[in-house]
């Protein structure tokens, strides 16, 4: 028997459209074969309509096509405008139609239910709007204009020219008669209910010169778009309800188990706190439309999600709303990396972000997560060197250890860094992935002077103390840039007096600049890694000054100052939002950080050779 | 919340038929496809046949060990499927469950179903 399974019956009426699908074993050899979609003829031949190499048919152009889903293992056929004409049997299959893997399926296509000749056909979506065209004559323009509904053998007047209107449809309904010479009037049904369903008859005068019209109106529920993600992705559900809508309050909600929706996130400021962090609804186009991107995908996530607009923000019966089923993915490409990174005032941290590594070129950015209203996220940090301006000397984006990582640096800690934070690219918007920084009691590893003043021409010696754990590490000074950290030479110099109890092993690593140049000016950082993968950080400002007296400057940390005040500098926010989130070239203009000099501060930071330590643990 | 309450099975003969039927009341308006699924004693409970909808499309699919004598319809007025099952085997004694679902990703698997009934107890004597 074929492992190769579908639907054996499909039915339908004509002028619709069918979405065959079709399920094979999703081996690598199965997810890359050839698919299609054959009709089996009076000689036993089945002849190709529609294949995954691009090939249609004739008879299917502009109304078929044959979608693969490799990481399901499923692919699926769509067919449109269907006619009696497509009824009859068939093969969905992978390799060569004689004699691949196949399933047969059998469509049949009926005309459907028999309306009343000329009757127009109204399909349209649970919630939404639609217009009814009822022509007449001249003689019935000033006659009563009229709009039935047929309920078996009766007929249900709804609306008329009188003013009347059904309790059924009040509030919701209108009926426009034009001006002079236009012969036909419309009536405007909003907010359509599944019950609205049904044959109604336009009526213009009465006896038996009326003018009258049939309609029939399908409405539909929506058919939810299934969605699969990778667990500790991300997924944007894009929700265009029309312009009639465009003014409602819009919401995300979730159907749980007693076939309610609860309210994932809506325009009116509410938001589930099992979304924290990880939500945002990005504002909506003129047309109404609108975004809602999650991140950090968990198992629990899935389920229906429904889209929609009220004015209580939730969902309510006979408004329009959109579908989706999500399935999260537990064989996920994204790899693991910590959600919650901690760090103590004062210290740093480093954050690994993933990014699909087919994508190596793409633009990186960091953005920090603001809950407020609909929630929002201003770029900190991008791989091109823009830093937002409060952020100066403290952040930096590293693009090691590379092949698919990425590393954020933000030290100088204040409670104000805890909060969640959003990796993302300007590529796959799948691998937006969010990490939340916790501010936790305690000291700094590193210790560095807070403020140095440098003398022009002259020699700066600045010391790094790092504690026995960080021995087997490689240390390294840096001097840093809006474009990112260059590390500079260093030297480790033997014990440090900072952590008694470390006896031998506690050691200091210090940062010569000889002779001082006023490209030094700015901040340095020091810092420990293990290969690619960044550890602490300490950064110290160095500003320099014209010379007074002459001599070397040796900073301790017992002389050493506070640390300077950050710069805070108005700026306009760079933010995820509309299409800025597929696209972060499109946000905002801002200003950017000066770049400060000559990243390698030129070439006179040296290290001290007279030293009996070996260079091989320090960065070079 | 959707229940479902099956009806029809009962003790036949080997060559006759039975007709069951599952009725759904509740919230049906997510419920997508509807179907069936029968366990044998000490056996997994195992895929029957299952119909899914869209509009006026209905997309009904089959176990191999059914195909040609069993079918599913359903009645949407009436929010209820049925199966009518032709040219029974013993083979074919098991409980018959109804199961529901708001969206299938493979109508095999008894996983992808959200609601279940309780089930109704075929038996076919040789």
């Known amino acids: 028997k074929s492992p190769v399974f579908g639907p054996q019956e499909v039915s339908s009426v004509e002028g619709n459209s069918v979405s065959i699908k079709c399920y094979y074993p999703p081996t690598s050899v199965n997810r890359h074969t050839r698919k299609y979609w054959c009709r089996k003829g009076a000689s036993g031949r089945c002849i190709t309509l529609v294949s995954s190499e691009g090939y249609v048919s004739s008879n299917y152009a502009g109304r078929a096509n044959l979608t693969n889903f490799p990481e399901n293992g499923t692919f699926v056929v769509n067919i449109a405008q269907l006619s009696r004409d497509d009824s009859g049997h068939y093969k969905c299959g992978l390799g060569i139609n004689s004699r691949g893997l196949s399933f047969d399926v059998s469509l049949e296509v009926s005309q459907g239910p028999e309306l009343p000749n000329g009757t127009e056909v109204y399909t349209v979506d649970v919630g939404r709007t639609v217009t009814i065209k009822c022509p007449f004559k001249t003689e019935n323009a000033p006659k009563t204009k009229a709009l039935y509904k047929k309920i078996g053998q009766t007929s249900v007047l709804v609306i008329d020219s009188r003013n009347y209107v059904n309790p059924n449809y009040k509030d919701r309904i209108r009926l426009r008669i034009p001006g002079t010479g236009q012969l036909i009037f419309t009536v405007v049904i909003d907010r359509l209910r599944l019950s609205d369903h049904g044959l109604y008859l336009c009526q213009a005068g009465d006896g038996s010169n009326r003018d009258e019209k049939n309609a029939d109106l399908q409405v539909l529920e929506p058919e939810p778009e299934l969605v699969y993600e990778d667990l500790r992705g991300s997924v944007t559900f894009h929700c265009a309800l029309g312009l009639e809508v465009a003014n409602v309050a819009k919401f995300l909600c979730r159907v749980n188990s007693r076939e309610t929706c609860d309210v994932v996130i809506n325009t009116l400021g509410k938001r589930d706190s099992a979304f924290e962090g990880r939500i945002l609804l990005n504002p909506q186009d003129k047309d109404g439309s609108f975004s809602v991107v999650i991140t950090g995908l968990r198992k629990e996530d899935e389920g229906r999600y429904l889209c929609g607009a009220h004015s209580d923000g939730q969902l309510q019966e006979g408004w329009p709303i959109q579908a989706w089923q999500l399935f999260v993915n537990e064989e996920s490409t994204i790899p693991r990396s910590p959600t919650v990174v901690k760090g103590v005032a004062g210290g740093s941290v480093a954050v690994l972000c993933p990014y699909n590594p087919k994508e190596s070129q793409s633009l990186k950015y960091w953005c920090l997560w603001e809950g407020a209203q609909n929630g929002r996220c201003p770029l900190l940090v991008e791989s091109q060197g823009l830093v937002q301006e409060q952020y100066e000397g403290r952040l930096s984006l590293l693009q090691e250890p590379g092949n698919g990582t990425f590393t954020v640096i933000l030290n100088q800690l204040t409670t104000q860094d805890a909060g969640f934070y959003w990796c993302l690219t300007n590529g796959d918007t799948r691998w937006r992935t969010t990490v939340e920084i916790k501010i936790i009691e305690g000291e700094p590893n590193l210790k560095v002077p807070g403020n140095v003043t440098a003398v022009l021409g002259e020699t700066l010696n600045i010391p790094c103390h790092f504690p026995c754990k960080f021995s087997s590490y490689e240390k390294y000074w840096c001097k840093w840039s809006n474009t990112g950290c260059q590390t500079l030479p260093s030297q480790d110099e033997g014990p440090s007096e900072a952590f008694v109890n470390c006896d031998e092993n506690s050691r200091l690593v210090s940062l010569t600049l000889n002779p001082v140049t006023r490209a030094d000016e700015g901040w340095y950082w020091c810092g420990v890694k293990q290969g690619h993968f960044y550890g602490e950080t300490a950064a110290v400002y160095v500003a320099v000054e014209e010379k007074k007296v002459a001599g070397s400057r040796y900073v301790s940390p017992a002389k050493a100052d506070a640390a300077p005040d950050e710069k805070v500098l108005d700026s306009g926010v760079r933010e995820i939002e509309n299409k800025a989130i597929q696209d972060p070239r499109l946000f905002a203009e801002e200003k950017v950080v000066a770049d400060t000099g000559d990243q390698a501060g030129g070439s006179r930071a040296s290290v001290d050779s007279s030293s009996s330590e070996e260079q091989g643990g320090s960065s070079k | 919340q959707v229940q479902l309450v099956e009806s029809g099975g009962g003790l036949v003969q080997a060559g006759d038929s039975l007709r069951l039927s599952c009725a759904a009341s509740?919230?049906?308006?997510?419920?997508?496809?509807m179907g069936w699924f029968r366990q044998a004693p000490g056996k997994e409970r195992e895929f029957v046949t299952t119909i899914t909808w869209s509009g006026s499309t209905n997309y009904k699919y089959y176990a191999d060990s059914v195909k040609g004598r069993f079918t599913i319809s359903r009645d949407n007025a009436k929010n209820t499927v049925y199966l009518q099952m032709n040219s029974l085997k013993p083979d074919d004694t098991a409980v018959y469950y109804c199961?529901?679902?708001?969206?299938?990703?493979?109508?095999?698997?008894?996983?992808?179903?959200?609601?279940w009934g309780q089930g109704t107890q075929v038996t076919v004597s040789s």
């Open positions: 509740g919230r049906t308006f997510t419920t997508y496809g």
């Open positions: 199961a529901a679902s708001t969206v299938l990703r493979d109508p095999r698997v008894p996983t992808e179903y959200d609601y």
